[in-house]
């Protein structure tokens, strides 16, 4: 499970509030860090192990997911044809 946590706020400038947000994710046994719907998530460790990246549903709804050659990452293709590539180190 993941929740968005506001780490700090800049109250020195009253006209605008700057909030730094991060995800706090507590993964269950057998899960490790991943990406689901373009957000941090906990995913089945075997997905990471086997590099079946699209199984963790990393793309936004309506986008198509494809594995890169050698399973080095994935691409998310928007309906309009724009492609976003993510590589895993």
């Amino acid at each position: 499970t993941c929740e968005i946590v506001t780490l700090d706020r800049d109250s020195s400038q009253p006209r605008r509030t700057i909030a730094r947000q991060t995800a706090r994710c507590a993964c269950r046994k057998g899960q490790i860090a991943g990406t689901t719907r373009n957000k941090p998530s906990c995913v089945d460790a075997r997905i990471i192990k086997t590099k079946q990246w699209c199984d963790m549903l990393p793309c936004l709804e309506g986008e198509g997911c494809d594995l890169l050659i050698n399973r080095s990452g994935w691409t998310c293709t928007q309906p309009g044809g724009r492609i976003k590539t993510t590589t895993v180190s």
Partner: antibody
Framework: AVTLDESGGGLQTPGGALSLVCKAS????????MFWVRQTPGKGLEYVAE????????NYGSAVKGRATISRDNGQSTVRLQLNNLRAEDTGTYFC??????????????????????WGHGTEVIVSS | ALTQPSSVSANPGETVKITCSGG???YGWFQQKSPGSALVTVI????ERPSDIPSRFSGALSGSTNTLTITGVQADDEAVYFC???????????FGAGTTLTVL
Amino acid sequence: AVTLDESGGGLQTPGGALSLVCKASGFTFSSHGMFWVRQTPGKGLEYVAEITNDGSGTNYGSAVKGRATISRDNGQSTVRLQLNNLRAEDTGTYFCARSTYECPGGFSCWGDTGQIDAWGHGTEVIVSS
Amino acid sequence: ALTQPSSVSANPGETVKITCSGGSYSYGWFQQKSPGSALVTVIYWDDERPSDIPSRFSGALSGSTNTLTITGVQADDEAVYFCGTEDISGTAGVFGAGTTLTVL
């Protein structure tokens, strides 16, 4: 190189308590789940306890549940096992172990027994009167 | 509980296979030369091999059974090999009773 160094073993009295410490070095300690595993004369290897990379989660083997407390200090790169109400069956060699998965910042991750990639040399505990 | 054979034997140069079944998630294999002495991981996360472990050691997962293979066994490989994983419910770690490898 990854090193895990256990200390705190020795002769203990039944009904007493012990505190074992594992000092880690050579890796980003706060990113890894950690384990205590013991080897008792009649039982082979036995899962004792584990703790998540950030210390928020703990789990215990059935033989020590209710008597053991595992904790960690990520600033000092140490993991501690406290075991109370000692019994003769607690006699054995206690090993500290690391789970290989490096949990990224912002995540709390459990280790996995099948992902243990490094062990300490072990510290011997004898419970006897 | 995990199931692994209590003992196997082989001549130098032969291939040895040790199976372990009954767990969940991933499997590891841990070598111990004598009781109470240091444990050495030879395989972790099903098939990963630490950099200092010879390539003759390999692991493979099929269903819920993991097989440790030692190709071209050597006298120095004589030891007890424990498998480790999570119990079937995924609530705690569990180890096999150990397989004693004797090199004839």
